[in-house]
Structures are given as C-alpha cells and as structure tokens.
C-alpha cells in the first residue's frame, strides 16, 4: 500500500482481551520446542498506564500454569521491557487489534542473546489468514520460514482456557 493513510487514534487498550497463540519463531529452535522456555501461549492481555499486562499459559508436567507478566513501556512507542527468563526487549511488529498481533523479543539470558517472534489471533478459525504476515515480519527481522513453528490445538493449552 503506497501513499499516505488516515490512522485510528486509539491506544494500547485496543489490544486488551482474549488472544490465541498461532505460531512461534526463533533463531534458537530449542527455545520454542516443547518444554522450551518460550513455548508459551497467550491467554489474554490488558493495558494500563501504557504498560502491557499479559496472562500466559506455560506447559508444565502435562498441565498448563497461568502466569501474569507485565511489559513496561519505553520511550519508543512499539518497544516494551519484559523480565522473563532474563531481560527481553519486546517489540510490537504488526497489529490489527481486532484480528492479529505479531510481536518479537530480543532475549538476553546468561550472556546469550536470542530472537523470538510470536503470532497471536483473536479468532482461531482465521489463523491461516495471518501466517503470511507473520512470515513477512519474520523475514524483516532476520528469521527464515524454516524457523517458524505453527502450533496445533494440542500445543497451545486449549484445555486450560476458561
């Protein structure tokens, strides 16, 4: 889409509500394999004071534990600071608050730096619609198609959702 466009005026609050994880990608495949630290699944999100609060589901011992995390705002509108398995610079990469959200994180843990990307959608029945956008963002940030893992219902703790 070339040219200039009018944009909406809403804020982070538009991201609030239920989300479903659809795909993960990383330059360190172990991080997003089963039992990897970043094989986690979004449950819901809310925004307050410019910070993002997320409830995530973490597979543990055959069950899923819900954990609350807060990503704190920075001077850059699409960047947040998150502490989870080390320090993360979390970036919103592409967003349609009614449909999908793509974020990526630069994780620093024990002097090791990793890149993890995450695609989430509002409506799981439309997940295929947004995989091309995820692949495009992954390309932008230096991840390849073969570094993407598309999740199945079994993967994403569906049974743990309210």
């Amino acid at each position: 889409q070339e040219g200039n466009h009018e944009e909406p005026q809403g804020g982070l609050e538009e991201l609030s509500g239920r989300w479903h994880s659809v795909a993960l990608a990383s330059n360190k495949s172990d991080l997003i394999k089963p039992w990897g630290h970043f094989r986690v699944f979004i449950h819901s999100m809310s925004a307050k004071d410019g910070n993002l609060h997320g409830d995530i589901l973490i597979p543990q011992d055959g069950q899923c534990e819900k954990v609350s995390l807060t990503a704190f705002k920075t001077a850059t509108s699409n960047k947040f600071d998150l502490e989870y398995w080390g320090h993360n610079d979390l970036y919103l990469a592409e967003v349609d608050p009614k449909s999908y959200l793509i974020l990526y994180m630069i994780n620093q843990y024990n002097d090791d730096t990793s890149l993890v990307a995450h695609l989430m959608v509002r409506d799981l029945s439309r997940q295929q619609d947004f995989l091309p956008a995820f692949e495009s963002v992954c390309e932008d940030i230096g991840l390849h198609k073969d570094q993407i893992v598309v999740l199945s219902d079994d993967d994403r703790c569906q049974g743990s959702r309210d």
Epitope: H5, E7, P8, E94, V95
Partner: nanobody
Framework: QVQLVESGGGGVQAGGSLRLSCVAS????????MGWYRQAPGRQRELVAT???????NYADSVKGRFTISRDNAKNTVHLSMDSLNVEDTAVYFC???????????WGQGTQVTVSS
C-alpha cells in the same frame, strides 16, 4: 496522516559523502521497519538499506561497507550515511517505513542524489 519527509540529497563528486535523513510523523504504535530505497532513471526501485526497531539492519550488496543506516526510534527518524559514492549511486532516494498498524507501508517523496565523475 502519515508523512515521511526526506532531506540531505544533492550533488557530490565521486568518492565523496552525503548523509540523508528522514522524519516520519507519529504513527499508531510506531514503525517496525524504516529504511531507504532508490530508483535510477529507467530502472526499478531497489532496496538500499533497512533497519528494524531493535536495530537489526539489512543492506543491498552494492552498498555494503560504504553506506550506514541508523535510526532514532523515539524521534521516528532514519539516517543514511553514504561514503565512497560512485556514479552508479546516482538515483532518487526514497524513505520507507512499515507501520506497526496493519503493517502498512509508507513512502517519502524522494530526494535526488547525483554523483559526478
């Protein structure tokens, strides 16, 4: 309405340097990718360099080692420092930004860079 405004173009002798700048207006959730493309007469627009929010860069092979892209996320600005310019670098240089909002792509009006031998 999103606008990208370029500056810094002009004429220079081969071997010289120029620095292009681009300021983007505030956008919903900001920009994930910013960068520069160029178009020489009779040719298609081509990538010069891009930089993502986290600082990762991508350069066209023809400019690697000569051009450096940088960015100030808080100010929505992107710069392109061009050294060791040669005649083949003559083109209109377009600022590019990919917004977080819907992944929309935006372009500046372009700034002329002319390198003479």
């Amino acid at each position: 309405q999103v606008q990208l405004v370029e500056s810094g173009g002009g004429g220079v002798q081969a071997g010289g340097s120029l620095r292009l700048s681009c300021v983007a207006s505030q956008s919903h959730f900001g920009y994930n990718v910013m960068g520069w493309y160029r178009q020489a007469p009779g040719r298609q627009r081509e990538l010069v360099a891009t930089i993502i929010s986290s600082g990762g860069t991508n350069y066209a092979d023809s400019v690697k080692g000569r051009f450096t892209i940088s960015r100030d996320n808080a100010k929505n600005t992107v710069h392109l420092s061009m050294d060791s310019l040669n005649v083949e670098d003559t083109a209109v240089y377009f600022c590019y930004a990919k917004g977080v909002w819907l992944g929309r792509e935006y372009w500046g009006q372009g700034t002329q860079v002319t390198v003479s031998s």
